[in-house]
């Protein structure tokens, strides 16, 4: 969470941004809020990126002005125009690229004053893992797969019964480059699993952490997955 203050004569407004992460190839949002101003035509929103000449996006007089927009953002950005008057200057970013990572500035000018705040935007790839029983293996095995990760994550297995056990000797993890030559598919196989136990496959890089749980009993297989972004907010 970053709060910036701006001073315009005697006037300053608070601008707040949130550090966030973008998933390569998906659509993302760079969050920014400011003190509301009912005079829409008096609000100017400018998004800038460190090291880039030209603007990421500009919104003024109630509409976009993309005349100064940098080529790399062409056709990829939009503000939530109907939410500007209530203080939402967040930016939608289409088809997030690795090169979109960096420091952005959300600059606001309203009839109340000026203000700005920076945000750090990380880009990578992260996806939910899916664990299945691998019936093709010679012994009872679990296969954990996640389709898209970048940078290369670490993979670790854990068990509810054998808490603290090191499964690195009885597991095998591989990383397969996807067709766009950036993200990778993660596959990890855990061997010699026992029935009536809950196993967890944990995939983590510096952007996200994902966990897949599986419980295998005689009568059923229960699965659960979750994903959390790291260092956000």
């Amino acid at each position: 969470l970053i709060i910036g203050f701006g001073i315009s004569g005697k006037h300053f407004i608070t601008v707040t941004t949130f550090t966030s992460a973008g998933n390569i190839g998906e659509d993302g949002t760079l969050s920014c809020t400011f003190e509301p101003d009912i005079k829409l035509n008096g609000i100017v929103i400018q998004w800038l990126k460190e090291g880039i000449k030209g603007l990421v996006h500009e919104f003024k007089e109630g509409k976009d002005d993309l005349s100064q927009q940098h080529e790399m953002f062409r056709g990829r950005t939009a503000v939530f125009a109907d939410q500007v008057v209530v203080g939402n200057a967040s930016l939608r970013l289409k088809n997030v690229q690795l090169t979109d990572a960096g420091t952005y500035t959300c600059y606001i000018h309203t009839s109340k004053g000026k203000g700005n705040a920076n945000l750090e935007y990380k880009t990578g790839a992260f996806s939910m893992p899916e664990i299945n029983v691998d019936y093709n293996a010679s012994s009872e095995s679990l296969r954990c797969e996640a389709p898209r990760w970048f940078p290369q994550p670490t993979v670790a297995w854990a068990s509810q019964v054998d808490q603290g056990a090191n499964f690195s000797e009885v597991s095998n993890t591989s990383f397969e480059l996807n067709s766009e030559n950036v993200t990778m598919k993660v596959v990890s196989v855990l061997y010699n699993v026992t029935i009536n136990n809950t196993y967890s496959c944990m995939i983590e890089n510096d952007i996200a952490k994902a966990t897949g749980d599986i419980k295998v009993t005689d009568s059923e297989v229960k699965r659960r997955s979750q994903l959390e972004l790291l260092n956000s907010g």
């Epitope: 659509d27 976009d64 056709g75 088809n95």
Partner: antibody, heavy 120, light 107 residues
């Protein structure tokens, strides 16, 4: 309501340059949230995006046509134009102009289209 | 470039019946997809954008769904004016590309 109208010659000789103009009425071409695009459709076939322009003059072209395409804008006349050089029979198509959202980038509305035949 | 594939090429449906049109992208386009309707001798008309948002003035019988690589346009109860060719278009990355179209004809 916003309307677009294509104009230009319906017949162009091979190796010459195809030139079309799109006139925008019922709204300003300087509306900030939109690009202005060209799309074509060969007879009985599908649609191909040619490229777009912003009112400030910045352009983006389909790489498959980039070496032959020029799109320009005249804000004083509320018009934008397409030039396609070194045409062949494969460029025979109905050419449409359309307003293109800056994002989302859907095309709406479209001009009625103009059939351009490349033939000697 | 992203290749858009539509199926079937032709769909024969009786008036009042449901029509389901498919569009597949060669790679994920998130929800950055639009659907258009084109009648003979006319320009295409925008029906859906953002994969599922109906354009202004489009009847509720038209609905879009899907994300990533698989998309569907559903016409819940075909009216006589709905018999036309339908195109999907991705605007996820340049160059924007269209599918080959699905012709919906009277059975």
């Amino acid at each position: 309501q916003l309307q677009l109208q294509e104009s230009g010659p319906g017949l162009v000789k091979p190796s010459e340059t195809l030139s079309l103009t799109c006139t925008v009425s019922g709204g300003s071409i300087k509306s900030g949230s939109y690009y202005w695009g060209w799309i074509r459709q060969p007879p009985g076939k599908g649609l191909e995006w040619i490229g777009n322009i912003y009112y400030s003059g910045s352009t983006y072209y389909n790489p498959s046509l980039k070496s032959r395409v020029t799109i320009s804008v005249d804000t004083s006349k509320n018009q934008f134009s397409l030039k396609l050089s070194s045409v062949t029979a494969a460029d025979t198509a109905v050419y449409y102009c359309a307003r293109e959202g800056s994002y989302p980038n859907q095309f709406d509305p479209w001009g009625q289209g103009i059939l351009v035949t490349v033939s000697s | 470039e992203i290749v858009m594939t539509q199926s079937p090429a032709t769909l024969s449906v009786s008036p009042g019946e449901r029509a389901t049109l498919s569009c597949r992208a060669s790679q994920s386009v998130s929800s950055n997809l639009a659907w258009y309707q084109q009648k003979p001798g006319q320009a295409p008309r925008l029906l859906i954008y953002g994969a599922s948002t109906r354009a202004t003035g489009i009847p509720a019988r038209f609905s879009g769904s899907g994300s990533g690589t698989e998309f569907t346009l559903t016409i819940s109860s075909l009216q006589s004016e709905d018999f036309a060719v339908y195109y999907c278009q991705q605007y996820h990355s340049f160059p924007f590309t269209f599918g080959g179209g699905t012709k919906v004809e009277i059975k």
